[in-house]
Amino acid sequence: CRTSECCFQDPPYPDADSGSASGPRDLRCYRISSDRYECSWQYEGPTAGVSHFLRCCLSSGRCCYFAAGSATRLQFSDQAGVSVLYTVTLWVESWARNQTEKSPEVTLQLYNSVKYEPPLGDIKVSKLAGQLRMEWETPDNQVGAEVQFRHRTPSSPWKLGDCGPQDDDTESCLCPLEMNVAQEFQLRRRQLGSQGSSWSKWSSPVCVPPENPPQPQVRFSVEQLGQDGRRRLTLKEQPTQLELPEGCQGLAPGTEVTYRLQLHMLSCPCKAKATRTLHLGKMPYLSGAAYNVAVISSNQFGPGLNQTWHIPADTHTEPVALNISVGTNGTTMYWPARAQSMTYCIEWQPVGQDGGLATCSLTAPQDPDPAGMATYSWSRESGAMGQEKCYYITIFASAHPEKLTLWSTVLSTYHFGGNASAAGTPHHVSVKNHSLDSVSVDWAPSLLSTCPGVLKEYVVRCRDEDSKQVSEHPVQPTETQVTLSGLRAGVAYTVQVRADTAWLRGVWSQPQRFSIEVQVSD
């Protein structure tokens, strides 16, 4: 037989076994010009020493073969002995290692069989009523196709599906969408209405994420507040990566899960912007404020479930950093300025009350005064910190107040509001004899003592009503008792107590009269 012709003799090898896992697959035959035809196929398994034979049976019942050698593509003309206008059956037999393997057959009319391309270029993927919709441009001059898809998950083999007939410049397919696993899809096409025409090759993989992005499983830790008033949020556990099917491993556009970090600064509610969304890879610095943090996972179908955490405020206080002066016009706070043109947020809330009751005020950008201080003033009429109770004050600063991650904590401290000198006056002062020349003075703790760091000291004053001599005794803010000694029997004394803050002298308590009785000996 001549090599260019189909040889009408028995093939030069024994019968075939089509049952093995290896062997020829995916035979495609089509017309490539007015008088030339091509068949191509895949071969799975070791290729060393394999000889391929393209087999053909005609409608007349006669059969022939082309010897292709080690090639997996063969061209022939309409003069090769194969009838191109009538139905023929073609298949491949591959002879290797003393056995023959056989491909599935194709039965077709060669003249009408056109080489169809799989979907080429961009395959758009969208979600439609709980299903997957794929859409692509029909390859040039190939309108009218039958389309199939195959799909697999990381744990399942290929499953075949049908897209139905297509007859337009764009083609589409509805496919199953998995809730929780990624899928790999491939598409192939063949000529519509041409009996037994060959399928195209499979398209490049289309990688599709699950409908629900995986819930992020991450953990955070927050570093200590630094000298600059900022603390770093660090990721302790990376989110788990989505398992991908074989053809989607490596570069798999379409299956990406993006994790975003949503920050919500709970403190200082009067600032312009309370939330900011960042990429999870870019871990921010935070002020000492309280935050809610959410990690949101999303894929091309939208966001999934999120995971949220609360980051409590840093409650480390700076008892000396804040000066407060109370005048007739109102109250002014002073603190060490951070830099030029800083916006400050002053937040206060009554101690022991819910964080939601915090009040705040935003200053205009300000430069340090000649003493290097920043200030905030308010009048008595404003009602700010006007009640006689303990307030927790935090001051935040930012050169860019519109950027949530650029705020820093300047200081946190306590302040007693209203008329602190009067409100702090100790009550229930009592005097008890202690010895022949001394007494013990006790009093109820000042209201100022409920405010950490505010009460600097108690002062106890003792006045000799005869000589008008006055002595004052400082007492630690944690003590509510003092012993006065060196007193004389029979003399009238008055005792008073006051509570002082770092910036304010307290108001004396009501005078308490006492005397030590003269001891008469028998």
Partner: nanobody, 123 residues
């Protein structure tokens, strides 16, 4: 060598159904095309249906199209012919045949043959 054994024939009333089986001895059977033929006394053997080794291609004589279905189970080395809406004209001995080639029409030279099974359709 492939040995074929037909079974499932019998007597059935017109309009009834039968299912014929063709079992093969050889493992290599899964790479063979299989056809059913029938013959009545004094007449030539007539092609009924054929199926390729993959099961992807089938072919039917015009007289049985829409009534008969050919299928195969390669795991069991068996080919089936499901015959529905039987007519008295379907009465014949049914033979199964196998060949390494698949013929796209009713014509073809089959290498291996079974002994046949009788199907009788009464009116």
């Amino acid at each position: 060598q492939v040995q074929l054994v037909e079974s499932g024939g019998g007597l059935v009333q017109a309009g009834g159904s039968l299912r014929l089986s063709c079992a093969a001895s050889a493992r290599i059977f899964n790479s063979y095309a299989v056809a059913w033929f029938r013959q009545t006394p004094g007449k030539e053997r007539e092609f009924v249906a054929s199926i390729s080794w993959s099961g992807g291609s089938t072919n039917y004589a015009d007289s049985v199209k829409g009534r008969f279905t050919i299928s195969r189970d390669n795991a069991k080395n068996t080919v089936f012919l499901q015959m529905n809406s039987l007519k008295p004209a379907d009465t014949a001995v049914y033979y199964c045949a196998a060949d390494r080639n698949y013929y796209p029409s009713v014509l073809g030279k089959y290498t291996y043959w079974g002994q046949g099974t009788q199907v009788t359709v009464s009116s």
